[in-house]
Interface confidence: medium
């Protein structure tokens, strides 16, 4: 049986004033319990952290990699794990924190001068490949500086909302992240009501635009819980 598509307004980097400083958790203004805010690279409820499910390293943040949480655990259950610092054991570049790479099973510091020329030439072609090569590693550390001299248009691949043009945010879509429109009045938004209800979210939505908040549609108050529709409405 096909599971339901799950959506989210929880974008990793909310731009001010909707969030905190870029790259930091959004402020919990007029928050209800269980509403999701970006916290690091996990979906953070006000009183709860949830591991982020993944299938590839690309699905995780720059300080994370995708792996089974338990050694020798079920390969089908993978989450984003914190990257490994210098001198820690590794199996591929993605496991090592930015500024490091995996050499002979150990995370070692990268000589930026040594790598930079090669990275600059290969970054555009390499983006999205497995993290089993230097190219995969290089994508993590220099992607934003290489690819985003111009702001991304709708549908462009992005890492964070600041990579996108005005009126767009960076949101997950099919496990990639692309620039999507910030929601307008009347458009469907997603508000999570229960802890852990977000599941595997491949269709994130942007947040509601300025002066709007995500609230239950007036004519849907009587509807069953499962079909309640939230839309962006004036405060």
């Amino acid at each position: 049986t096909l599971n339901s598509v799950l959506n989210s307004n929880a974008i990793k980097n909310l731009p001010p004033p909707l969030g905190g400083a870029a790259g930091h958790p959004g402020s919990a203004v007029s928050a209800a319990p269980g509403i999701l805010y970006p916290g690091g690279n996990k979906y953070q409820t006000i009183d709860n952290y949830q591991p982020y499910p993944c299938a590839e390293d690309e699905e995780c943040g720059t300080d994370e990699y995708c792996a089974s949480p338990t050694r020798g655990g079920d390969a089908g259950v993978q989450i984003c794990l914190a990257c490994r610092k210098r001198r820690k054991r590794c199996m591929r570049h993605a496991m090592c924190c930015p500024g490091n790479y995996c050499k002979n099973g150990i995370c070692v510091s990268s000589d930026q001068n040594h790598f930079r020329g090669e990275i600059e030439e290969t970054i555009t072609e390499s983006f999205g490949n497995d993290h089993s090569t230097l190219d995969g590693y290089s994508r993590r550390t220099t992607l934003s500086s290489k690819m985003y001299h111009t702001k991304g248009q709708e549908g462009s691949v992005c890492l964070r909302s600041s990579d996108c043009a005005s009126g767009l945010c960076c949101a997950r879509h099919f496990w990639s992240k692309i620039c999507k429109p910030v929601l307008k009045e009347g458009q469907v938004c997603t508000k999570h009501r229960r802890k852990g209800s977000h599941g595997l979210e491949i269709f994130q939505r942007c947040y509601c635009g300025e002066g709007l908040s995500c609230r239950i549609q007036k004519d849907h108050h009587q509807a069953s819980n499962s079909s309640r529709l939230h839309t962006c409405q004036r405060h």
Partner: antibody, heavy 116, light 111 residues
């Protein structure tokens, strides 16, 4: 200009095999998930398969599971669909599509006819 | 399983507005949030017209709009033109595993 060009279609007998290719250009191929969608003559659209940007994550419609294999070669900017144990009901135009903002770009399709 | 139901055909005169509905089964209410619409002219590839229920990709005329209420998504075409005559498909996605479902399609005839 985003372009997707399918090839490899043709006439094949039931039980036979065929490999479709989709050459992509005009965008960074390795940054996008890709899909195959088919359309039987005079019928509607049916999603067949999807593949992640690196190829390590693949998904199939129940109707083709175990018979079709989706793959990609990012160095060649090419998407593939290996079709084995073909049946008459697999007869269709096969489209490759980019999974950007949904299925935002499609090729013109290649016709696969399964008949004895 | 997810099922999307569309009317087989609709028609309208030039300048009129028409609406095509797409109804999801109750089992996919949660998954029916993300709905897209595609236009397909005979012998041509489908074209994305609306994504996430109401968003138009760049280049798509603002005569096309989408909405959703309860279990039904709708595509409205205002100021109908001859070139709008085509088949229209709604579509949604399911996850774990990833899968996509299309409606049966609606043939739009411009009288």
């Amino acid at each position: 200009q985003v372009q997707l060009v399918e090839s490899g279609g043709g006439l094949v007998q039931p039980g036979g095999s065929l490999r479709l290719s989709c050459a992509a250009s005009g965008f960074t191929f390795s940054s996008y998930w890709m899909s195959w969608v088919r359309q039987a003559p005079g019928k509607g659209l049916e999603w067949v398969s999807g593949i992640s940007y690196s190829g390590s994550n693949t998904h199939y419609a129940d109707s083709v599971k175990g018979r079709f294999t989706i793959s990609r070669d990012n160095s060649k900017n090419t998407l593939y669909l290996q079709m084995n144990s073909l049946r008459a009901e697999d007869t269709a135009v096969y489209y490759c599509a980019r999974m950007g903002i949904d299925l935002d770009y499609w090729g013109q399709g290649t016709l696969v006819t399964v008949s004895s | 399983d997810i099922a999307l139901t569309q009317p087989a055909s609709v028609s309208g005169s030039p300048g009129q507005s028409i609406t095509i509905s797409c109804t999801g089964t109750s089992s996919d209410v949660g998954g029916f949030n993300y709905v897209s619409w595609y236009q397909q002219h005979p012998g041509k590839a489908p074209k994305l017209m609306i994504h996430d229920g109401s968003n138009r990709p760049s280049g798509v005329s603002n005569r096309f709009s989408g909405s959703k209420s309860g279990n039904t998504a709708s595509l409205t075409i205002s100021g109908l033109q001859a070139e709008d005559e085509a088949d229209y498909y709604c579509q949604t996605w399911a996850t774990s595993p990833l899968s996509s479902v299309f409606g049966g399609g609606t043939k739009l005839t411009v009288l």
